[in-house]
């Protein structure tokens, strides 16, 4: 004979756990249904009635199967230095990430709490380590034979041009100027 399928709520066998998408209710002492993502528990189960679920209200969400009585509030709207990479829905929180030219100075579980502009290396300095989503640009002085004449968060130090005859020697912030030979 096939084993009987237990319908929630049911008392679990001693030593056994509730099935997937069920939870053990310590008051009812029963295995009861969880609510699906996008829902929350409106009425907890009893010994004879299963969990009653309801949809999350606007600007709230649940991402997992759950038995919480209230959905979580979506995070506040993205600030002007951020872009919304994931909208707030009943099943997921809003995710804000930093817009181009900015990095995340203070992260949160998902997305970024505080963005900051990427450092710009001034003339005479080039990018030693590029900025990432979560780290700032690192600048370094241009080594002899290299230069950077821009204020930039992306430009590296470039080699001076090689002249047959140098008119003006290059330095850290300026390229060498070559003498042009007339024909």
């Amino acid at each position: 004979l096939p084993a009987q399928v237990a319908f929630t709520p049911y008392a679990p066998e001693p030593g056994s756990t509730c099935r997937l998408r069920e939870y053990y209710d310590q008051t009812a002492q029963m295995c009861c249904s969880k609510c699906s993502p996008g829902q929350h528990a409106k009425v907890f189960c009893t010994k004879t009635s299963d969990t009653v679920c309801d949809s999350c209200e606007d600007s709230t969400y649940t991402q997992l199967w759950n038995w919480v009585p209230e959905c979580l509030s979506c995070g506040s709207r993205c600030s002007s230095d951020q872009v919304e990479t994931q909208a707030c829905t009943r099943e997921q929180n809003r995710i804000c990430t930093c817009r181009p030219g900015w990095y995340c100075a203070l992260s949160k579980q998902e997305g970024c709490r505080l963005c900051a502009p990427l450092r710009k290396c001034r003339p005479g300095f080039g990018v030693a380590r590029p900025g990432t989503e979560t780290s700032d640009v690192v600048c370094k002085p241009c080594a002899p034979g290299t230069f950077s004449n821009t204020t930039s968060s992306t430009d590296i130090c470039r080699p001076h041009q090689i002249c047959n005859v140098v008119a003006i020697p290059g330095n850290a912030s300026m390229d060498a100027v070559c003498t042009s030979t007339s024909p």
């Epitope: 907890f44 004879t48 009635s49 009653v52």
Partner: antibody, heavy 119, light 106 residues
Framework: QVTLKESGPTLVKPTQTLTLTCTFS??????????VGWIRQPPGKALEWLAH???????YYNPALKSRLTITKDTSKNQVVLTMTNMDPVDTATYYC???????????WGQGTTVTVSS | DIQMTQSPSSLSASVGDRVTITCKAS??????IAWYQHKPGKVPKLLIH???TLQPGVPSRFSGSGSGSDYTLTISSLQPEDVATYYC????????FGGGTKVEIK
Amino acid sequence: QVTLKESGPTLVKPTQTLTLTCTFSGFSLSTLGMGVGWIRQPPGKALEWLAHIWWDADKYYNPALKSRLTITKDTSKNQVVLTMTNMDPVDTATYYCARMTGTRYFDVWGQGTTVTVSS
Amino acid sequence: DIQMTQSPSSLSASVGDRVTITCKASQNINKFIAWYQHKPGKVPKLLIHYTSTLQPGVPSRFSGSGSGSDYTLTISSLQPEDVATYYCLQYGVLWTFGGGTKVEIK
């Protein structure tokens, strides 16, 4: 408007059985998620949960008092009745009934009724 | 059974003071805690449920926080009308009240 009112004897003798009735309005115990519970407060002491009954007749009792308590409901009369056997002077208290929400906290309380146990 | 240890049992503070009442459960109660205000001769009034959800009509100076087994009720600026006894109620496993905190004005 949700209201609850407790009624019953103000004085009972030791060993007697106490019967308290909670009559309520503004909600129905046939509505999904509704429940009514009893709480008491001895003079100068803290609140103590006694028993609870749900819309589907599921019942819960304070484990320390379970053997002495019985809770029943009459949905048509909008009433919940609590009986407590073998009363003792330490059971002297104000007895409250309160509505319980589907997520299990008491949101509206009755005014309470004072019961004295004395010979 | 879950025990709820509420502290302090009484306190006296000045109008405008920040007042904090704590309840410690004997096990994790998954945020299933409510707070009640009980004034002499009056009915207990629900202030907060599910740790931090304020009941409609309750002044915003009342707030709740906590998780696991430790929970707090805070009155950000004590008012004369806040004189009462405050109780926590855990409803994670059956129902248990804390011992109460009597709040008075200095």
